[in-house]
Interface confidence: low
């Protein structure tokens, strides 16, 4: 089955610059299929822009200004690129690549879409580092004791642009765990978001990862925030204990920045 | 030019209660086109649901039913038993791929219909309230309540900033919420919740611990012993900005 990946979750540009968006095709030979590009402007319908066929023929939607969009396919890396020249405010949109995928039953086809890349145009001069800054919260002892479960919370702050994806996995597993998240909120010129994961008691002794995808992550790779395992077998109801009384029976986590 | 027009901009649905989305075609006969349905979820993922004739995306056949009403020139998508996973924007789109003659392999989309999912009407449930802290950051976790109306207060005399709460449907079909804030006196912050004309405090749920660690350090990690017998393990946070974390119980 054909699968489309758009590695850039967002692409931030200043006016008049060139944006290059990538789409990686797997599960099907790019040289044997056509790749389509669609645009979804805020509040408008999703619109076909341009396609490139298996033989390299390019077809543009009527009404699209010539010279604005350039589409290419690179068989060597199974990649199609959409180049947007001289970006302007009206180019702000989410851009999707798509292809027709044949179903097992002869003659049946469906069009599958990539996850989209949001083109953001800014005139702001932002701080050098606008990657998401993580703060972690471990389960409260009360929750682990009373509910035989624990909630991890991953707070991400001071990032730009607002496009961010967060998911959770156990340390040595690729299975994505069911989590919940708040809306992305604006704070001054940057954004914040949080996501939380509730796990049953039997999973508390495993390490968990909050995995964050953002355009400005260092080196362009997903940021992994490790949540250490929790020991639950030591919790008692002894009122005389004063070890963590001053911290309201929660864990106080102090994050120290030791990067250069 | 043809246009696809959804019946509603927003459709609230209840978990388990069937719902129907409709999309009419203007300017052409719907029978001349193939109709497709897609769902866009948080994070912009566009997932294929249905295409004539009887083609369903993986995992959709059991819970979705696509149809065409040629007399009314409209497309219909039924969600047979909605769950919280079905929340998102639903799009109808048409093409003429494989119909012979002048055909278009591009999709023409209608505007989306936002489907919001609500829990089924059910007996009222009082929330559990827990506080989680890290430095000046405090989170109030409110679990498993119904109905949705709730007021969450983080009680502090030294507020730096507070954020609007996130309220979401829990996997069990009730609600969960989290409210975050930053406080100079985070150690003394508690959380109180007004729900269903009652007040619930985080302190109602506090338990005492013995003097052993709550976080299990790895074999290879160093642990320092503070004056009380509480472990202070080092945990590695794989991020570019934060790479050392000390835990104090």
């Amino acid at each position: 089955a054909g699968h489309l990946e758009q590695p850039q979750i967002s692409s931030t540009k200043t006016l008049s610059k060139t944006a290059r968006l990538e789409c990686v095709v797997s599960g099907i030979t790019i040289s044997a299929t056509s790749v389509y590009w669609y645009r979804e402007r805020p509040g408008e319908v999703i619109q076909f822009l341009v396609s490139i066929s298996y033989d390299g023929t390019v077809r543009k939607e009527s009404g699209i200004p010539s010279g604005k969009f350039e589409v290419d396919r690179i068989p060597e890396t199974s990649t199609s690129t959409l180049t947007i020249h001289n970006v302007e405010k009206q180019d702000i949109a989410t851009y999707y690549c798509a292809l027709w995928e044949a179903q097992q039953e002869l003659g049946k086809k469906i069009k599958v879409f990539g996850p989209g890349t949001k083109l953001i145009i800014t005139d702001k001069q932002l701080d050098a580092d606008v990657s998401p800054k993580p703060t972690i919260f471990l389960p409260s002892i009360a929750e682990t004791k009373l509910q035989k479960a624990g909630t991890y919370l991953c707070l991400l702050e001071k990032f730009f642009p607002d496009v961010i994806k967060i998911h959770w996995q156990e340390k040595k597993s690729n299975t994505i765990l069911g989590s919940q998240e708040g809306n992305t909120m604006k704070t001054n010129d940057t954004y914040m978001k949080f996501s939380w994961l509730t796990v049953p008691e039997k999973s508390l002794d495993k390490e968990h990862r909050c995995i964050v995808r953002h355009e400005n992550n260092k080196n362009g790779v997903d940021q992994e925030i490790i949540f250490p395992p929790i020991k639950t077998d030591v919790i008692t109801m002894d009122p005389k204990d004063n070890c963590s009384k001053d911290a309201n029976d929660t864990l106080l986590l102090q994050l120290t920045n030791t990067s250069a | 030019a043809i246009e696809l027009v959804p019946e509603h901009q927003t459709v609230p649905v209840s978990i388990g209660v069937p719902a129907t989305l409709r999309c009419s075609m203007k300017g052409e006969a719907i029978g001349n086109y193939y109709i497709n349905w897609y769902r866009k979820t948080q994070g912009n993922t566009m997932t294929f649901i249905y295409r004539e004739k009887d083609i369903y995306g993986p995992g959709f056949k059991d819970n979705f039913q696509g149809d065409i009403d040629i007399a009314k020139n409209l497309a219909v998508l039924k969600i047979l038993a909605p769950s919280e996973r079905d929340e998102g924007s639903y799009y109808c789109a048409c093409d003429t791929l494989g119909m012979g003659g002048e055909y278009t392999d591009k999709l023409i989309f209608g505007k989306g219909t936002r489907v919001t999912v609500e829990p089924r009407s059910q007996p009222h449930t009082k929330p559990s309230v827990f506080v989680m802290k890290n430095g000046t950051n405090v989170a109030c976790l409110v679990k498993e309540f119904y109905p949705k109306d709730i007021r969450i207060n983080l009680v502090s005399s030294k507020k730096i900033t507070e954020f609007d709460p996130a309220i979401v449907i829990s996997p069990s079909g009730k609600y969960n919420a989290v409210k975050l804030g930053k406080y100079e006196d985070s150690n003394s912050v508690t959380c109180s919740v007004q729900h269903d004309n009652k007040t619930v405090h985080s302190t109602d749920f506090e338990v005492k611990t013995d003097s052993t660690d709550h976080v299990k350090p790895k074999e290879t990690e160093n642990t320092k012993q503070p004056s009380k017998s509480c472990h202070k393990p080092k945990a590695i946070v794989h991020t570019e900005k934060v790479n050392m974390m000390s835990l104090t119980v």
Epitope: H3, E5, P7, S26, T29, S31, E76, N219 | -
Partner: antibody, heavy 120, light 111 residues
Framework: QVQLQESGPGLVKPSETLSLTCTVS????????WSWIRQPPGKGLEWIGY???????NYNPSLKSRVTILVDTSKNHFSLKLSSVTAADTAVYYC??????????????WGQGTMVTVSS | QPVLTQSSSASGTPGQRVTISCSGS????????VNWYQQFPGTAPKLLIY???QRPSGVPDRFSGSKSGTSASLAISGLQSEDEAEYYC????????????FGGGTKLTVL
């Protein structure tokens, strides 16, 4: 500038699995395809396969049943596993970056290679 | 057996022009770009020509590439003794779901 360094055992027994790692330094593994290529002594180059930083792979059909290429973005490295090896798998193994944009799929940066001998 | 065909050896005297040819099929050279690599004994190959005729920075303009139909060639003008090396052509092959294919290599000797 970006440099590649192969590492792994120089001797593997027949029928066992050959495992090599390629560490990318001086740049990010992100947004590129990364390949493994081998060269038996005195012979030409043979392409083994590539991986995209997100995990998508493509393998040489003649080796597909025995090859696994994995990527670890957090460690900025990718790896090769070749199972059920025989003496015919004795070769210098190179890792290489597949160029983007105008470099259109050329292997633009290579590791220095590591010799692997299959012998009991 | 290499998918692309190269003559096993070529030779020339300093200052001469030498051409190395590479022949393929419609599914590789015919529909994709050709790259050339230079390899000295005991070292890793180095990219010499990409996209049929483009030189990476640092490669002297004595080296040029061309492609016609299902064949490609590498020309070296003003041959120098340091050009003595093995030269490989490479392309991608659509019929094999885009794997890389190499020629068998041409050993260039400067007499």
């Amino acid at each position: 500038q970006v440099q590649l360094q192969e590492s792994g055992p120089g001797l593997v027994k027949p029928s066992e699995t050959l495992s090599l790692t390629c560490t990318v330094s001086g740049g990010s593994i992100s947004s590129y395809f990364w390949s493994w290529i081998r060269q038996p002594p005195g012979k030409g180059l043979e392409w083994i396969g590539y991986i995209f930083y997100s995990g998508s792979t493509n393998y040489n059909p003649s080796l597909k049943s025995r090859v696994t290429i994995l990527v670890d973005t957090s460690k900025n490295h990718f790896s090769l596993k070749l199972s059920s090896v025989t003496a015919a798998d004795t070769a210098v193994y190179y890792c290489a970056r597949v160029g983007r944009w105008e470099l259109r799929g050329a292997f633009d940066i290579w590791g220095q290679g590591t010799m692997v001998t299959v012998s009991s | 057996q290499p998918v692309l065909t190269q003559s096993s050896s070529a030779s020339g005297t300093p200052g001469q022009r030498v051409t190395i040819s590479c022949s393929g099929s419609s599914s590789n050279i015919g529909s994709n770009t050709v790259n050339w690599y230079q390899q000295f004994p005991g070292t890793a190959p180095k990219l010499l020509i990409y996209s049929n005729n483009q030189r990476p920075s640092g490669v002297p303009d004595r080296f040029s590439g061309s492609k016609s139909g299902t064949s490609a060639s590498l020309a070296i003008s003003g041959l120098q003794s340091e050009d003595e090396a093995e030269y490989y052509c490479a392309a991608w092959d659509d019929s094999l779901n885009s794997p890389g294919v190499f020629g068998g290599g041409t050993k260039l000797t400067v007499l």
